[in-house]
Interface confidence: low
């Protein structure tokens, strides 16, 4: 099944050219998406090409600039945020990246009523996080790990927390592990719907072991970066949740929200907070052994000014076959009665589906069902529920948007996107205005991405927001590779794969094969999305076949496949890549003497283990920033899938699943090991230990480090990396330069 639709081809074939590495490194064929910044049911903001902030009204058709590019430029602003009362805008500048989501910045407040910046009681700098209240123009911000509140932008700040300390106590922002592995945000504070209350997390990292690595910089002496980072089995952060009344913040101060007794009895995590109303909040907690999650609904007690979380409002979600949830435990979407909610979790057949919980989880009403999975609940209105799934035509790597009418019985289901642009668009996400009056659909492929605006009642398309015309024109004279998504049936397991084939692919010829692998738990590589990237170039210009395979442990195909890797990382993921390669060889067009594998992060771990599998299938391979032992990686992630590295738990498999244990097996492959020295995520330690083991085994290998680069190897390092990897592969495959 060829997924990439045919393009408008130039009549003269000889004007077509292959992709170059330079095209990829320059981002020549990158695409744009359009996500409206909704500010009401029918209005949104968008930053124009010339950097004016423009307000659009869908119903009147009007648009006007609320903030000029001149004002933006006056403080070198790279981002903005309009207060809900539309009186002020914060302007963000001096962006300084920290970890995956976190950054610090300088903030200026611009008064739209008088066209001037607010003077007096200016915000300190740099600020770690800042946000408006959902109503009015209160500001909450985090500075030096403490939370501050302003009733109005020009007011003096009210200090909410006082115990914040760098690398010790984090208020309103997550520590490293919560940011990366639990919350996936830069913030840990949440306004109630009307801004009456502000909830926040306090993370105590006092007893967490610290990862320390050198940052070389330009000075005579390197500096040391210290991050409290709990590796598998280590002491974890201690979390507490507080809520403060922002109208009268000084009365009782922050009030702690109690932890459910069944959770508090041993190590635990806080996983998310969802406000239901101004006086009802929902917290989700997770045992350290992450197969039990508790959702706790808490109510404000006016008489005591405290938060009460009755046991009758605790809902337990437990997995008997793996960990709780998918990558994360799903979050609830509350209905208008402010007590019942919709949530995605495994049904009795082991597929993740939407359930409606009114009183107890046991009495949950299943809303969707089938041998496919519901992936995200976008919005619940009084009469509709919008969600995405991979149901359509049984392709796990697709995403379509559905609407279920919940106002009628039985509920009727409609696929909003399935037939809109069927060839071009099979992978969607959506963004809804207030009350789902309007929504934007963003299609990621397999054709050129397109963003459109729709009426929330009728689903009718109103206009195209972005169709990437320039990209379409630029690609007209490019020989793009062909792509196909198919499946292999092996021993009761379905292995979906994506194959990227050279433009002039001929089944009767033999081609070198490169396997690109990630393979981490709850990941998905085989997706119907558009991309012109490094592997597109390798197929287009260098004539390689590239394959991506979703094996056991990957997501959205049911719990049997997902939880197969539970407590056994590094086994089945590798086996399934090898199985797929054998099947590809059987197809007849693969040169079995020229097969390589490469991956990054978890993919680096899998590629390393595949190379060291002793099968003789792979001639060479690359591992970028690989995990080499699960004892070196973060507790929250690792223990979710592996349990604890203790004798009475799973220490044996922790030891058996290291790359170092297989050092001897690298003797007959060409191995390129790559890592950034300032990788805060998968520490350089991982590659250092692989290198040491290979040296000790007297095994030859190639290596490249990137000084002061993190897990993303960005900037100039990216160019160097892909150039270096290209040379390595071409040499491995005996392709001339």
């Amino acid at each position: 099944i060829v997924l990439r639709p045919p393009r408008v081809h130039n009549s003269e074939e000889n004007t077509m050219r292959a992709l170059t590495l330079k095209d990829i490194l320059n981002g020549t064929f990158s695409y744009k998406t359009f996500f409206p910044n909704w500010i009401s049911g029918q209005e949104y903001l968008h930053q124009s090409a010339d950097n004016n902030i423009v307000l659009y009204n869908i119903e009147t058709g009007q648009s006007y600039t609320i903030l000029s590019n001149r004002t933006m430029k006056s403080v070198n602003a790279s981002n903005y945020g309009l207060s809900p009362d539309r009186q002020f805008v914060y302007l963000e500048s001096d962006y300084s990246k920290l970890w995956r989501y976190s950054y610090t910045a300088t903030y200026y407040i611009y008064d739209l009523s008088n066209g001037e910046f607010v003077r007096g009681n200016e915000l300190p700098r740099p600020i770690q996080y800042l946000c408006w209240s959902p109503v009015g123009s209160k500001l909450a911000y985090v500075y030096q790990n403490n939370i501050y509140l302003k009733q109005r932008p020009g007011d003096p700040p009210f200090q909410i927390t006082f115990n914040g300390r760098e690398n010790k106590i984090f208020n309103g922002i997550p520590d490293w592990v919560y940011e990366e592995e639990m919350l996936a945000t830069k913030y840990a504070l949440w306004w109630s719907p009307n801004g009456k209350f502000l909830a926040y997390a306090e993370f105590n990292d006092t007893d967490i072991p610290v990862i320390a690595y050198s940052y070389y910089g330009d000075e005579q002496y390197p500096r040391t970066i210290n991050i409290p980072y709990p590796k598998a089995g280590a002491k974890n952060p201690f979390v507490r949740i507080f809520i403060i009344d922002t109208t009268y913040p000084a009365y009782v101060g922050p009030q702690e929200v109690p932890v459910p007794a069944m959770i508090a009895s041993s190590d635990y995590y806080f996983s998310w907070l969802t406000w239901v109303t101004d006086e009802r909040v929902c917290l989700q907690w997770l045992k350290r052994v992450q197969n039990v999650s508790v959702l706790s609904i808490c109510d404000f007690r006016e008489d005591w000014q405290t938060w009460d979380c009755p046991k009758t409002q605790e809902h337990i979600e437990e997995s008997r076959t793996g960990w709780a949830g998918g990558f994360f435990v799903s979050t609830p979407v509350f209905s208008y009665d402010a007590i019942s909610y919709y949530k995605i979790f495994s049904d009795k057949d082991g597929y993740k589906h939407i359930h409606y919980i009114k009183d107890t989880v046991e009495n949950a009403i299943q809303i969707t069902s089938g041998k496919w999975e519901a992936i995200n609940i976008f919005r619940v209105t009084q009469d509709s529920l919008f969600y995405s799934s991979n149901e359509f035509e049984d392709y796990p790597g697709r995403r379509n948007i559905y609407r279920i009418s919940i106002g009628s019985y039985p509920p009727s289901k409609k696929c909003v996107t399935c037939h809109l642009r069927k060839e071009r668009c099979q992978y969607y996400t959506a963004s809804f205005s207030d009350y789902a009056k309007y929504y934007a659909l963003v299609c990621y492929g397999p054709g050129i991405p397109i963003s459109t605006l729709h009426d929330g009642r009728t689903d009718q398309e109103i206009k195209i927001l972005e169709e990437n015309k320039e990209l379409e024109n630029a690609l007209k004279n490019i020989q793009l590779p062909k792509e196909e998504i198919k499946k292999l049936e092996v021993d009761e397991i379905t292995l979906w794969y994506k194959m990227i084939l050279p433009p002039q692919f001929d089944r009767s010829k033999k081609y070198p094969l490169l396997i690109q692998v990630y393979g981490g738990p709850c990941s998905q590589s085989v997706r119907s999305v558009f991309a012109v990237n490094w592997i597109s170039y390798l197929a287009s210009k260098e004539g390689m076949v590239i394959a991506l395979v979703d094996g056991r442990g990957t997501a959205f195909q049911g719990d049997k496949l997902l939880y197969a890797v539970y407590r056994k990382l590094g086994v089945y993921e590798v086996e399934d890549q090898i199985t797929a390669v054998r099947k590809f060889i059987e197809m007849g067009f693969i040169d079995e003497k020229r097969i390589a594998i490469w991956g990054w992060s978890y993919g680096g771990y899998v590629s390393s283990l595949a190379l060291a599998s002793g099968t003789g299938l792979f001639k060479c391979g690359i591992a970028v920033a690989p995990v080499s032992s699960w004892e070196y990686y973060a507790s929250v992630y690792t223990e979710r899938f592996m349990g604890l590295p203790t004798k009475d738990d799973n220490l044996e498999h922790y030891k058996n699943s290291t790359v170092m244990a297989r050092a001897e097996y690298f003797r007959n492959v060409d191995y390129l090991l790559i890592h950034g020295t300032a990788d805060d995520n998968v520490h350089f330690q991982n590659s250092a230990q692989i290198a040491k083991a290979l040296v000790n085994a007297q095994v030859d290998f190639q290596a490249m480090w990137y000084s002061d680069q993190n897990h993303g190897l960005s900037g100039l390092s990216t160019n160097h990396l892909y150039t270096h990897m290209t040379h390595f592969l071409k040499q491995c495959f005996s392709l001339s330069d």
């Epitope: 003096p156 909410i160 006082f162 106590i169 000084a250 009782v252 005591w304 000014q305």
Partner: antibody
């Protein structure tokens, strides 16, 4: 160093209104991240919280006194005031102004106090 | 309102004695409890906050413990300047309330 000083008449007749002012020095009422409180202590008895005010004028009063209490703030003079109407002999007490402090554990305490002023309700 | 009950209401002790004062809350107040010392004609002075944290400048002979409903203030070795009245105060819910006081007198 923050200092608080209560001032006002030491004698008030029954049914009249007790009025006290607290002058803050060593810190600005409006630039501080704190709130300002009144607490009283009848002779030989324990302490009773009356109410508090934020620099913006937001107030909270002890429900037991709410109907009779008004606390106001004058940021230009760096002062806040207490009015207690319809007083009786039971309102005879030492009246303290105080500034509570609190931090991330959800706890707060009264860290700064005035020296107190005795108000007697008697005809 | 949360009632705070101190015991004893008064006690006699000698210099060097170990003195313990208890405070009981009418409902659980977690660790949201503070202790004050008051001398005649003076304003109260903060000793302990958050049940067990010593306010800076307060001698280490003062210590606090407890959580939930039962709390204790301990003076490990009574000094002449410690003869005073001691109050507990909860900040768990509004309004903040104080105990009735414990008077420590010279034996």
């Amino acid at each position: 160093q923050l200092q608080l000083q209560e001032s006002g008449p030491g004698l008030v007749k029954p049914s009249e209104t007790l009025s006290l002012t607290c002058t803050v020095s060593g810190g600005s009422i409006s630039s501080s991240s704190y709130f300002w409180a009144w607490i009283r202590q009848p002779p030989g008895k324990g302490l009773e919280f009356i109410g508090n005010i934020y620099y913006s004028g937001s107030t909270y009063y002890n429900p037991s006194l709410k109907s009779r209490v008004t606390i106001s703030v004058d940021t230009s003079k760096n002062q806040f005031s207490l009015k207690l109407s319809s007083v009786t002999a039971a309102d005879t007490a030492v009246y303290y102004c105080a500034r509570p402090s609190y931090y991330g554990s959800g706890n707060y305490y009264f860290a700064f106090w005035g020296q107190g002023t005795l108000v007697t309700v008697s005809s | 309102d949360i009632q705070m009950t101190q015991s004893p209401s008064s006690l006699s002790a000698s210099v060097g004695d170990r003195v313990t004062i208890t405070c009981r809350a009418s409902q659980s107040i977690s660790s949201y409890l503070n202790w004050y010392q008051q001398k005649p004609g003076k304003a109260p002075k903060l000793l302990i906050y958050a049940a067990s944290s010593l306010q800076s400048g307060v001698p280490s002979r003062f210590s606090g413990s407890g959580s939930g409903t039962d709390f204790t203030l301990t003076i490990s070795s009574l000094q002449p300047e410690d003869f005073a009245t001691y109050y507990c105060q909860q900040s768990y819910s509004t309004p903040p309330t104080f105990g009735q006081g414990t008077k420590v007198e010279i034996k």
